[in-house]
């Protein structure tokens, strides 16, 4: 029977007695920055080229004995997980290894930087097909390492990294914290976060997704036919590097943004037990376990979106938090969240020629998060329409008035500290779904987009009694682009998208009376692109 980890990432239609998905990543080259490797292991022989790059620190300790099999252990195993003949994910992918970790698994930022530069130069000298760079390492936060990753990513290289094994916020580590890198946490055979001794997988908003990372069978550097089980986020990252190689081999023109969106889209959703994570990290950590797409083609018709959380704003009165989409993505909506419920909303604003999502803390608040909904929408022309606070008691309204523009998201932002505490809810007039409605004291922002074949609709779910969470989901074939709460519900902590579901969170119901103040309405904007659907039918 196939190893559990390969079965886990394999869609049911591939599952026979063996793991044999079509096209094993043969058009893709994967660079591995790790320890030295045993390239003549039968699992990887002829698949991995050992480059002459080596930049490692001296081993610690006077009694350290260099033993080849120990020096090669980590890298050999990972090379096997990515492209091993027997227990590899992308059995057709070729690899190149660079040694940046010593026999104790230690490296330096400078060694990794020089390794990345080596790859960039190799790419310029001899351009090949799509490149994936696997960085199965984690150190303290490094602005310079993150910047180097950003440069390489912007040159068209896909970087995949380990989230780190410190049972901590991945944003405190590099390269895990680099937004351009695909950061991978580790789960086990029960789809639970991996525990490693007293520590375990990192988590948080800097993790893009999880992948199998416990008891992973792979090539052992002990001997040419030896196999061993290893665990950690390095193994998880190797799975995603393999999946990326498979996807890029099937669709070599995929951009980094498209690849990341597909990795997220095809992941298993909501299978991880979030109780393992610290309470304050649960909402920020993606509940996604990587998997291969069920078919190598035909995903192009879908409108792909993902949720990007900002860093925490901090508690100061005027503190703000900013969430940004990747360069190739469109910001289709913006929401905010505060655990204390004290916030002054959010707004979409231009920054460096691109829209960003900014959330505002309120006096006495413990801080806010901005939540961006980032989507792939080719040929899109999006703009933000703002209505200042209204004079009328009916509240503030704004709609998309330009011909062919559709509403993809609503945001509201206010200056007063305790907006709506004693105000009844404002009801949306029937038959006017293409507009954003808010408190009269708030300025309302509508995200309006024009793209070929784009259509959107508003879905609401209201609960009259107080409840900690109200959700509304888009149906099959539609993608959630906007998520907000209908105004008037003062105890709302915020709104955010989880996959295709809009979640509106409220304060602990025990502190809220069951008056009309308790009513909570979640508003989802669901979109689809008929143009993308037609384009994919033509391609096939």
């Amino acid at each position: 029977s196939i190893p559990w980890n390969l079965e886990r990432i394999t869609p049911p239609r591939y599952r026979a007695d063996e793991y044999q998905p079509p096209d094993g990543g043969s058009l893709v080259e994967v660079y591995l920055l790790d320890t030295s490797i045993q390239s003549d292991h039968r699992e990887i022989e002829g698949r991995v080229m050992v480059t002459d790059f080596e930049n490692v620190p001296e081993e610690d300790g006077t009694r350290f004995h260099r033993q080849a099999s120990k020096c090669d252990s980590h890298g050999t195993h990972l090379a096997g997980v990515v492209s091993g003949r027997d227990a590899g994910v992308a059995k057709g992918a070729s690899m190149r290894s660079l040694r940046v970790l010593n026999c104790q698994g230690k490296g330096t930022v400078s060694g990794t930087l020089i390794g990345l530069e080596f790859i960039r130069k190799s790419q310029l000298v001899q351009p090949v097909g799509p490149l994936v760079v696997l960085l199965p390492l984690a150190g303290g936060y490094s602005r310079v390492l993150n910047a180097a990753c950003q440069r390489l990513a912007r040159a068209g290289v896909v970087l995949v990294t380990a989230a780190g094994n410190f049972r901590d916020d991945a944003c405190l580590y590099s390269p895990a914290s680099a937004p351009e890198v695909i950061t991978v946490g580790a789960t086990n055979a029960q789809d639970q976060p991996v525990t490693l001794g007293t520590l375990g997988t990192n988590f948080g908003r800097c993790v893009d997704l999880f992948a199998p990372g416990e008891d992973i069978i792979g090539a052992s550097s002990d001997c040419s036919t030896c196999f061993v089980s290893q665990s950690g986020t390095s193994q998880a990252a190797a799975h995603v590097a393999g999946i990326a190689a498979m996807m890029l081999s099937a669709e070599p023109e995929l951009t980094l943004a498209e690849l990341r969106q597909r990795l997220i889209h095809f992941s298993a959703k909501d299978v991880i037990n979030e109780a393992w994570f610290p309470e304050d990290q649960r909402v920020l950590t993606p509940n996604l376990v990587a998997a291969l797409p069920p078919s190598t083609h035909g995903a192009g018709w879908q409108l792909f979106c993902r949720t990007v959380w900002s860093a925490h704003s901090g508690p100061t009165r005027m503190a703000t938090a900013v969430a940004r989409c990747a360069p190739d993505e469109e910001l289709l909506s913006c929401s905010s969240f505060s655990r204390s419920g004290k916030r002054r909303g959010e707004r979409m604003e231009a920054q460096g020629g691109k829209l960003v999502c900014r959330a505002h803390n309120a006096f006495g608040g413990e801080g806010v998060y901005a939540i961006a909904r980032c989507c792939l929408l080719p040929q899109a022309n999006c703009s933000v329409h703002t209505a200042p606070p209204a004079e009328a008691s009916m509240g503030t309204r704004v709609h998309c008035h330009q011909q062919g523009h559709v509403l993809t998201g609503c945001s509201s932002h206010w200056e007063v500290e305790d907006l709506g505490t004693h105000k009844p809810p404002v009801l949306r007039p029937r038959g006017q779904p293409n507009q954003c409605v808010g408190h009269r004291e708030a300025s309302i922002h509508a995200s309006c987009c024009h793209a070929p074949g784009l259509e959107c609709k508003v879905k609401e779910h209201g609960i009259p009694a107080p409840q900690e969470q109200v959700t509304v989901a888009c149906e099959e074939g539609w993608t959630l682009t906007g998520c907000s709460a209908l105004p008037g519900t003062s105890h709302v902590l915020g709104a955010y998208a989880v996959d295709n579901t809009c979640v509106v969170r409220s304060r602990d119901v025990s502190t809220t009376g069951s008056t009309s103040e308790g009513a909570v309405t979640a508003v989802a904007i669901c979109c689809r692109s008929r143009h993308l659907a037609q384009a994919s039918q033509e391609l096939q």
Partner: antibody
């Protein structure tokens, strides 16, 4: 049941070429390695090399490198051993055997192909 | 290359008696990653292909009578036939399968005394 069936005995002259075969059945051919083993008359077993039918990658024993070619056609679950120019010293019984990454010993053997090279 | 040396070259044992064959490897075939010895024993009867008896130095292949047992670790190994039967007349080979080239012992011929 799982079996490896080899082609029949061959009698050849020195300098001639030859390709013998080993057909796998009853299992997933591309999941297992196929090795070739030589046994000269009255002698012991000598490992010649392996092929992985999944990607047709081969690894030869230094003693046999350049002397023989191992190949496979996964569409018909068959591995081959060939010579471009036979020598009298190639006279031997040749066995194919399979092994797996999780079971790297030879659990199934072919019945053998006797190759006789004589002028 | 790992050299495998068997002793004795031939062995004559009475029916029902114990037969012991030794095998020594020029380097250890025990590996810490899984704590296994990468050593197998094969039986070859005249006119037949070899047949797997023992793998991982001491695990009996299914269908092999329990009078066959393997022991040893590292570099020194033993195949024991606890009570020799007429059908056990054959040549026995040890083999290491941890590194390439794969190597066999020269063989031990077991006969009935």
């Amino acid at each position: 049941q799982v079996q490896l069936v080899q082609s029949g005995a061959e009698v050849k002259k020195p300098g001639e070429s030859l390709k013998i075969s080993c057909k796998g059945s009853g299992y997933s051919f591309t999941d297992y390695y196929i090795s070739w083993v030589r046994q000269m008359p009255g002698k012991g077993l000598e490992w010649m090399g392996w092929i992985y039918p999944g990607d047709s990658y081969t690894h030869y024993s230094p003693s046999f490198q350049g002397q023989v070619t191992i190949s496979a056609d996964k569409s018909i679950s068959t591995a081959y051993l060939q010579w471009s120019s036979l020598k009298a010293s190639d006279t031997a019984m040749y066995y194919c055997a399979r092994d797996h990454w999780s079971k790297p010993y030879f659990d199934v053997w072919g019945q053998g192909t006797l190759v006789t090279v004589s002028s | 290359d790992i050299v495998m040396t068997q002793s004795p070259d031939s062995l004559a044992v009475s029916l029902g008696e114990r037969a012991t064959i030794n095998c020594r490897s020029s380097q250890s075939v025990l590996y810490s990653s899984n704590n296994k010895n990468y050593l197998a024993w094969y039986q070859q009867k005249p006119g037949q292909p070899p047949k797997l008896l023992i793998y991982w130095a001491s695990t009996r292949e299914s269908g092999v009578p329990d009078r066959f047992s393997g022991s040893g670790s590292g570099t020194d190994f033993t195949l024991t036939i606890s009570s020799l039967q007429a059908e056990d007349v054959a040549v026995y080979y040890c083999q290491q399968y941890s590194s390439f080239p794969i190597t066999f012992g020269q063989g031990t011929k077991v006969e009935i005394k």
